[in-house]
């Protein structure tokens, strides 16, 4: 049967009809007290006073109603739920899960996690109407959690006119014996005490450090995973995991060594709605990795743009080496990750100045051989793309990945519909291709062009007539990623090079071989 | 802190091979290198792997008789001499590289003799 | 191949006293990155080599401040401030600019 709900849009949390709830108001000490009415939440102000005996948990403030039992806590930056025990920051989860108390509410197969206060889910062994629900990490939220000790977190989804238990795809913490932190690592609990310059983590309990906010003396030092040890952590929301240190003799701080758990070549990707000559129009999301080079010219004003790019770590851009053939002093780029449309700013948009550049020694002119190039993002910290829905790396191949001959891949950029055209794309497109042997990749087949071992080919293979609209890179598109799925990840295949034309038929585009410069992309990003 | 344990002495005929292993715990960011040191004498870097992605750089003059492998699933490093000769007779270091060799294994001694 | 050259050979030194290596490469090891990665290690005998100085003037962590580094291009010294008799064993420099990448002969220190 259908029910009035209320959603607390502060909260997300949801209330049946005539239920009453306490929430703190964001940013004051104030409390409202709200009823459910119709599916719609009334509101107003209550006095309250501090609460008789602790109820809130990670150092939040408890708050009961002069006139009445109820409570409401408010909680330190980073928890959230009734009682503060949510962890909005936990990235992952330890072991089985069974004290997961983060916000990942999707389940293995897509599908959204129900609420474990829904009414639909009040004769479920498990629900948020549990006497020992909170202890469980259930209540007024959708997030996955491990109530029973089963092998992963896991929540109720509809499907098949019914609600049943999945298991989520929440990331584990520790994928095998990794050691590596996920998002900003405030949920590390790894063992890394080295910085990046290489010098020791102090103890967080150490006399030195006395005085200092984040210490194991802090109240919530367990919270934040700091006490009789040295390893990095986040305790205040920093870039990455860090610890302090002792730098001649002075007592300093630094982000350590942990690498990142790697969440290259996700996406969130979105069938595209229309076709281009070339292509399809497409969303950042879908290619998060792609970048956008613009460059000032000595001789004009403003920018203009220049190549695509690929961000293949929080710092490095991989392109291609021809981009750069006006030699442009660093300065003088500017690159730009996160953006739909090419000379319109996304609302998510992230936008960094190039420290430096490095085209391949032997990048030949003529024959395009060697055509890779890296740019160093320009950055206070030793992090630079903040990783979003929008702003991902792309996975780079495993040496000996070798797909086999016709396998679909996609490209992306912002080059032009077709060679003719006087303009570059307005939109991202994106392209679907497929690898060609190498046998079908040599100079016959590409008029006569040099075609060297470090290059491959790709190109759309269906059969069209003169009106085919058959996809292709195109100029403008240079430096950007050709991607193929590998073990359920977009990998690096290709940088997009070179072609004759675009969008010839059984003419295909020719790409840098990206499992050729694995040992030079590694040697150049060294710190 | 990163460990490196490098498998035991070996004792090859001349024209053999010989495959020494590294295990490494902790953070290998970027290379496993391997250096030999013949008794008595100076440091030699034969080359390096990528622990991550198994990319390669050798040192031209093993180039076609060494091969560096890597078994991410058990985080061990392999390096693999073939056509052993008498003056391949040293101690292989395996190291890691971050911002330098900070890390080195205890070193494996690799005999060849007939 | 960069061919790095050290001197002296071997360097008897008194406890307390300064000593300096020298290190020589055959061309230029700044790395089209722009960094210098010229590093010292020490190898006491018995043992593997130990990271000093990395970067031509970084001490590696736990190194004590005695150990500095310095130089440019292609002229780079290493200097012991006060050595003392635990510092014995001999010094390699290194360049991990170019592939191959090299170490320097070794310079050997011991107690006169």
């Known amino acids: 049967s259908y029910q009035v709900i209320c959603r607390d849009e502060k909260t997300q949390m949801i209330y049946q009809q005539h239920q009453s709830w306490l929430r703190p108001v964001l940013r004051s000490n104030r409390v409202e007290y709200c009823w459910c009415n119709s599916g719609r939440a009334q509101c107003h102000s209550v006095p309250v006073k501090s609460c008789s005996e602790p109820r809130c948990f990670n150092g939040g403030t408890c708050q009961q109603a002069l006139y009445f039992s109820d409570f409401v806590c408010q909680c330190p930056e980073g928890f959230a739920g009734k009682c503060c025990e949510i962890d909005t920051r936990a990235t992952c989860y330890e072991d089985q899960g069974i004290s997961y108390r983060g916000t990942w509410s999707t389940a293995e197969s897509g599908a959204e996690c129900t609420n474990w206060n829904s009414s639909a889910l009040a004769q479920k062994p498990y629900s948020g109407r549990r006497p020992d629900a909170i202890r469980l990490g259930l209540g007024n939220h959708n997030y996955c959690r491990n109530p029973d000790r089963d092998s992963k977190p896991w929540c109720y989804v509809f499907k098949a006119g019914k609600y049943s238990s999945e298991f989520c795809s929440t990331p584990a913490c520790s994928e095998g014996n990794s050691d590596c932190y996920f998002g900003n690592g405030s949920a590390y609990r790894g063992t890394h005490s080295l910085t990046e310059s290489g010098a020791s983590c102090l103890p967080w309990n150490s006399m030195i450090l006395i005085g200092k906010v984040y210490t194991a003396q802090n109240p919530s030092a367990q919270a934040l995973g700091l006490g009789k040890h040295n390893y990095c952590r986040n305790p205040d929301g920093d870039a990455k995991p860090w610890c302090h240190v002792l730098k001649n003799r002075r007592l300093t701080w630094e982000y350590c060594d942990v690498p990142s758990c790697s969440t290259c070549g996700l996406r969130q990707y979105s069938q595209p709605q229309f076709r281009i000559k070339g292509g399809l129009f497409a969303d950042i999301a879908s290619h998060p990795w792609q970048a956008a080079i613009f460059a000032k010219h000595r001789r004009s004003p403003g920018e203009r743009f220049l190549c695509g790019g690929i961000l293949i770590s929080s710092c490095w851009i991989l392109s291609a080496a021809h981009c750069f053939q006006e030699r442009f002093p660093p300065h003088h780029l500017t690159v730009i990750l996160g953006r739909t449309y090419r000379v319109v700013p996304g609302e998510e948009e992230q936008k960094f100045e190039v420290e430096k550049y490095i085209v391949h020694k032997e990048f030949d002119d003529d024959t395009y051989d060697n055509d890779i190039a890296l740019l160093q993002l320009k950055s206070d910290s030793s992090r630079c793309a903040q990783e979003s829905s929008v702003v991902r790396t792309v996975c780079l191949p495993p040496a000996d990945l070798q797909l086999p001959d016709w396998t679909e891949c996609e490209l992306s950029g912002y080059g032009k519909h077709e060679a003719l055209s006087p303009f570059y794309s307005e939109r991202l497109k994106e392209a679907h291709v497929r690898l060609y042997p190498s046998s079908r990749c040599t100079s016959q087949h590409l008029l006569n062009r040099t075609v060297t071992d470090n290059m491959l080919c790709a190109g759309d293979t269906r059969s069209g007539g003169p009106q085919a609209n058959l996809h292709d890179a195109c100029q403008g598109d240079s430096g950007g990623p050709l991607v193929c799925l590998n073990d359920g990840r977009m990998t690096l295949v290709g940088i997009i090079s070179w072609g004759l034309g675009c969008g010839q038929k059984d003419v295909p585009g020719v790409y840098t071989k990206v499992t050729n410069y694995l040992d030079w992309i590694r040697d150049n990003m060294r710190p | 802190q990163v460990q490196l344990v490098q498998s035991g002495a070996e004792v090859k005929k001349p024209g053999a091979s010989v495959k020494v292993s590294c295990k490494a715990s902790g953070n290998t960011s970027y290379w496993i290198n391997w250096i030999r040191q013949a008794t008595g004498q100076g440091l030699e870097w034969m080359g390096r792997i990528d622990p991550g992605g198994g990319s390669t750089g050798y040192a031209q003059k093993f180039q076609g008789r060494v091969t560096m492998t890597r078994d991410t699933s058990i985080s061990t490093a392999y390096m693999e001499l073939s056509s052993l000769r008498s003056e391949d007779t040293a101690v292989y270091y395996c190291a890691s590289y971050y911002y330098a060799m900070a890390y080195w294994g205890q070193g494996t001694l690799v005999t060849v003799s007939s | 191949d960069v061919v790095m050259t050290q001197s002296p050979l071997s360097l008897p030194v008194t406890p307390g006293e300064p000593a300096s290596i020298s290190c020589r490469s055959s061309?230029?090891?700044?790395?089209?990155?722009?960094?210098?990665?010229l590093d010292w290690y020490l190898q006491k005998p018995g043992q593997s080599p130990q990271l000093l100085i990395y970067?031509?003037?970084n001490r590696a962590s736990g190194v004590p401040d005695r150990f500095s580094g310095s130089g440019s291009g292609t002229d780079f010294t290493l200097k012991i401030s006060r050595v003392e008799a635990e510092d014995v064993g001999v010094y390699y420099c290194f360049q991990g600019s170019h592939v191959p990448w090299t170490f320097g002969g070794g310079t050997k220190v011991e107690i006169k």
């Open positions: 061309q230029s090891i700044v790395h089209s990155n722009g960094n210098t990665y």
């Open positions: 970067k031509v003037s």
